[in-house]
């Protein structure tokens, strides 16, 4: 019962987590910026992995997608890749875990198969969660190290002067959604792995039978006979371990499983 509950809860937690990872990946608010140098109206800029948006206090909002792939910062591409890998692994994990659920019967699937599937999905959820956490953390680090406060450096460029706009870059809501979602997926994966241990059938204690030679060094002789060691009589030259059922006349006897020790 506890195993079923752990597995079921792990599945639900992972499902919520993966839904969160998808939501975070699609959200526009990964980075938010207040543009200070505008004397007209408050301008709020926010960016996601796929597009950038400008919102003004007047109500005007416009978003534009990053249509190019080659020109974008490598770090953005890396974050995109991590999030997509996380979603794909999570989706496959969910699919596998549905069939692995103890409460769902599919044909005559054994518990050992369900245990393996539960472990597989658990590992997938853990990797998925780690990918999401890594992706969000890489983006957050990019904001902290490069953009936290762009100073107004002025320099001359072609066509006149250029200056960086003094903006304050802050963490967007998507980062927090991503962190929480990644954590939930990770926790769900761990729960699935724990459930797997309970699902795995108990190891069968097979009775091991050991056979021992009667003498010190039993030499094998052609014809299926064994030579005496000199300790003990064995004068009738009977086959050892054969219960004395056959004599030397039964030369063409087939070797039994006891003949080779």
């Amino acid at each position: 019962m506890a195993v079923t509950a752990c597995q079921g809860l792990g599945f639900v937690v992972s499902l919520i987590g993966i839904a969160g990872i998808i939501a975070a990946t699609c959200m526009d608010q990964w980075s938010t910026q207040d543009l200070y140098n505008n004397p007209v109206t408050a301008v709020f800029n926010y960016q996601g992995l796929w597009r950038s948006c400008v919102r003004e206090s007047s109500g005007f909002t416009e978003c534009r997608g990053y249509f190019t792939l080659l020109g974008l910062p490598a770090m953005l591409q890396a974050v995109r890749a991590l999030m997509i890998v996380g979603i794909v692994l999570g989706a496959i994990g969910l699919l596998v875990s549905i069939f692995a659920l103890k409460c769902i019967r599919i044909g005559s699937m054994e518990d050992s198969a369900k245990a393996n599937m539960t472990l597989t999905s658990g590992i997938m959820f853990i990797v998925s969660g780690l990918c999401a956490i890594a992706g969000v953390s890489v983006f957050a680090n990019m904001l902290v190290t490069n953009f936290w406060m762009s100073t107004a450096n002025m320099y001359t460029g072609m066509g006149g002067m250029v200056q960086t706009v003094q903006t304050r870059y802050t963490f967007g809501a998507a980062l927090f959604v991503g962190w929480v979602a990644g954590g939930l997926t990770l926790i769900g994966g761990v729960m699935m792995c724990i459930a797997c241990r309970g699902l795995a059938p108990e190891e069968t204690n097979y009775k091991a039978v050991s056979y021992h030679a009667s003498g010190h060094s039993v030499a094998y002789k052609p014809g299926g006979f064994k030579a005496s060691t000199g300790f003990g009589s064995n004068t009738k030259n009977k086959k050892i371990y054969d219960g004395g059922a056959r004599t030397e006349d039964e030369v063409q006897s087939y070797p039994s499983k006891h003949d080779y020790v």
Epitope: N37, Q47, S52, G71
Partner: nanobody, 122 residues
Framework: QVQLVESGGGLVQPGGSLRLSCAAS????????MGWVRQAPGKGLEWVAV???????NYADSVKGRFTISRDNSKNTLYLQMNSLRAEDTAVYYC????????????????WGQGTLVTVSS
């Protein structure tokens, strides 16, 4: 590389009109606010007018009611319609634009043009 090129300046009589244009070109991702700043001979920079991407405009008190700023987002072009010009409007007019580049859509820059000279004299 981004370039802002002003045009439309020249000599005009007091009370006359001029229309300045500023065309932005290059690897621009998104232009936010655009504006005009002027520098009269021997004086410092004076802010004239600014317009956001959404069309919200603001003017310096000295030009209110006489100048009109507008923009065409699809062409990345800024305009300044100057009416009832006075001698004190004589200056080099610079256009500037807050924008980000295709290669770095997470960072905002203000680019400035080389300027166009407007002379108001009889």
């Amino acid at each position: 590389q981004v370039q802002l090129v002003e045009s439309g300046g020249g000599l005009v009589q007091p009370g006359g009109s001029l229309r300045l244009s500023c065309a932005a070109s290059g690897s621009i991702f998104l232009i936010n606010a655009m504006g005009w700043v002027r520098q009269a001979p021997g004086k410092g920079l004076e802010w004239v007018a600014v317009i956001t991407r959404g069309g919200s405009a603001n003017y310096a008190d000295s030009v209110k009611g006489r100048f009109t700023i507008s923009r065409d987002n699809s062409k990345n072009t800024l305009y300044l319609q100057m009416n009832s010009l006075r001698a004190e409007d004589t200056a080099v007019y610079y256009c500037n634009a807050d924008l980000n580049l295709r290669s770095d859509p997470f960072k905002w820059y203000t680019f400035w043009g080389q300027g166009t000279l407007v002379t108001v004299s009889s």
